[in-house]
């Protein structure tokens, strides 16, 4: 009688994360008697994946009812694939032994390979915030995926961008892969309502990619621009003066009046008027009564944005042209913009 | 669901002999093999040996090999240890144990006293 | 035979504590063959960890296992009151099939 053979019949399968594994196996013979085992790797070191007489294997279940007496078909089911279960596995024949059952013959082999899937790209921007012309750094990462083949690309308001780092590790074999990829931006004015996308392309996800964003709203700080006028008086001895506080962005903005370097109001911008690019106005006004003023007055609006430096702008208030009242000590009346004090 | 239920306990005099059945239900009894465990009193654990059912075939602790026969009946789906010539240090629970060692019986007291 | 030695005999530790079973084998075990068990007091034994780090079904995760060749480690990370019972690896890479002497592991 011929020899006993063990046919493994696929030299690979191609398995998706999560799914089951068939892995076919069948002998020629029923004899010797003895037990069919898998494993996974050869060598010593070699993973026990089955066993059918001994041993835990709640993953594997067999093809055929292996208690059967002609039986000679030993495929198994794996469940729940992931990628660690990549790997060559062996359909092994046990010959019966004392004390332990002896190695007899084994299949060629079948390699399982594992697609998986890449996890959500994770888009993450600068700690700090950077102002327009700045270039800042984007970094987009995905993990758990194979095979290694991966494709990214980077967008800014759905255009391409083309100045970037990606690195896909390890760089040898594994059972599953990250990719890591660092994108440089040039900020401009508009950037408020942008948006930076990161776009992961792979074979398991069937040509629909994965995206990972970042709004520029949380990397973008756009400086105010001030303006100091003078309006028309709007009575006797007392002038309006308004700072208006231009484009800027994020909202967190104090504003502080000076008087000739002397603290005359502090206040926080609340009420303001978004432009359609995202960014921000805002105007607050000064009433100032002139008559309590010997000589002219330099006026100064002083601006803290969202906890950069101060910027201010001044403006030079005449007083000469105007009657001074006697006995007056008060140096100024200060109203918000939203406020009328009438004396 | 996967039950091995074990016979009563048995109090032995020493040089007896005494079979501990356990019989199986809720799996294909013949899918795997069937051991067999012992715990002194205050003791650790003790393999006494195996049997497969598809063939009867049957390993044994050299510890025990001349004294312990490991038997089954497909039919009742039974697997039985007989343990001869008792001794007092014998007195142990006896378990039986599928061979995926997840299922175990609740365990048999055997007492080997004069 | 395969000789499976544990350690210590008896672990005395507070709820909340990590602990830490150690089972040494008097020749290499491929860690496939390496089981843990816990048993307590009037109980069968029941499975805890197969192929040396793999938990068994209802087995909670604060349990872990690691090692191979010689040197095996069962892990409580953070011990709960009924984590209190007798822990036993067992091998079954050879014949005869052996267990450890048991690391009991009691409330201090």
């Known amino acids: 009688e011929e020899e006993l053979q063990v046919i493994q019949p696929d030299k690979s399968v191609l398995v998706a994360a999560g799914e089951t594994a068939t892995l076919r196996c069948t002998a020629t013979s029923l004899i010797p008697v003895g037990p069919i085992q898998w494993f996974r790797g050869a060598g010593p070191g070699r993973e026990l994946i089955y066993n059918q007489k001994e041993g835990h294997f709640p993953r594997v279940t067999t093809v055929s009812d292996l208690t059967k007496r002609n039986n000679m078909d030993f495929s198994i089911r794996i469940g729940n694939i992931t990628p660690a279960d990549a790997g060559t596995y062996y359909c092994v024949k046990f010959r019966k032994g004392s004390p332990d059952d002896v190695e007899f013959k084994s299949g060629a082999g079948t390699e399982l390979s594992v697609r998986a899937k890449p996890s959500a790209p994770v888009v993450s921007g600068p700690a700090a915030r950077a102002t327009p012309q700045h270039t800042v750094s984007f970094t987009c990462e995905s993990h758990g995926f194979s095979p290694r083949d991966i494709t990214l690309k980077w967008f800014k308001n759905g255009n391409e961008l083309s100045d970037f780092q990606t690195n896909v590790d390890p760089v040898g074999e594994s059972v599953s892969y990250s990719i890591h990829s660092t994108a440089k931006v040039v900020l401009t004015r508009e950037d408020v309502h942008s948006q930076v996308i990161c776009e992961v392309a792979h074979v398991t996800l069937q040509g629909d990619p994965l995206r990972g964003t970042a709004n520029l709203s949380e990397t973008i700080r756009v400086p105010p621009t001030l303006e100091v006028t003078q309006q028309p008086v709007r009575a006797e001895n007392q002038v309006n003066v308004t700072c208006q506080v231009r484009k800027f962005y994020p909202q967190r903005l104090q504003l502080t009046w000076l008087e000739n370097g002397n603290v005359s109001r502090t206040e926080t911008a609340s009420t303001v008027t978004e432009n359609k690019d995202g960014t921000y106005n805002w105007m607050s006004w000064l009433l100032v009564n002139v008559s309590a003023h010997r000589d002219d007055v330099k006026l100064t609006c002083q601006v803290e944005h969202d906890g950069q430096p101060a910027v201010s702008k001044s403006h030079d208030l005449k007083v000469s042209a105007h009657p001074k009242e006697q006995g007056s000590n008060t140096a100024a009346e200060n109203t918000g913009s939203n406020e009328r004090n009438i004396y | 669901q996967v039950q091995l239920v074990q016979s009563g306990a048995e109090v032995k005099k020493p040089g007896a002999s005494v079979k501990v059945s356990c019989k199986a239900s809720?799996?294909?009894?013949?899918?795997?093999?069937m051991h067999w465990v012992r715990q002194a009193p205050g003791q650790g654990l003790e393999w006494m040996g195996r049997?497969?059912?598809?063939?009867?075939?049957?390993k044994y602790n050299p510890k025990f090999q001349d004294r312990v026969t490991i038997t089954v009946d497909t039919s009742t789906n039974t697997a039985y240890m007989e343990l001869s010539s008792l001794r007092s240090e014998d007195t142990a629970v006896y378990y039986c144990?599928?061979?995926?060692?997840?299922?175990w019986g609740q365990g048999t007291t055997v007492t080997v006293s004069s | 035979e395969i000789v499976l030695t544990q350690s210590p005999g008896t672990l005395s530790l507070s709820p909340g504590e990590r602990a830490t079973l150690s089972c040494r084998a008097s020749s290499s075990v491929s860690s496939s063959y390496l089981y843990w068990y816990q048993q307590k007091p009037g109980q069968a034994p029941r499975l805890l960890i197969y192929?040396?780090?793999n938990l068994a079904s209802g087995i909670p995760d604060r349990f872990s296992g690691s090692g191979s060749g010689t040197d095996f480690t069962l892990t409580i990370s953070r011990l709960e009151p009924e984590d209190f019972a007798v822990y036993y690896c067992h091998q079954w890479y050879s014949y005869p099939r052996t267990f450890g002497g048991g690391t009991k592991v009691e409330i201090k």
């Open positions: 809720g799996f294909n009894f013949e899918d795997t093999y």
């Open positions: 192929s040396t780090s």
């Open positions: 049997i497969d059912p598809a063939d009867g075939d049957t």
């Open positions: 144990v599928r061979g995926n060692y997840v299922n």
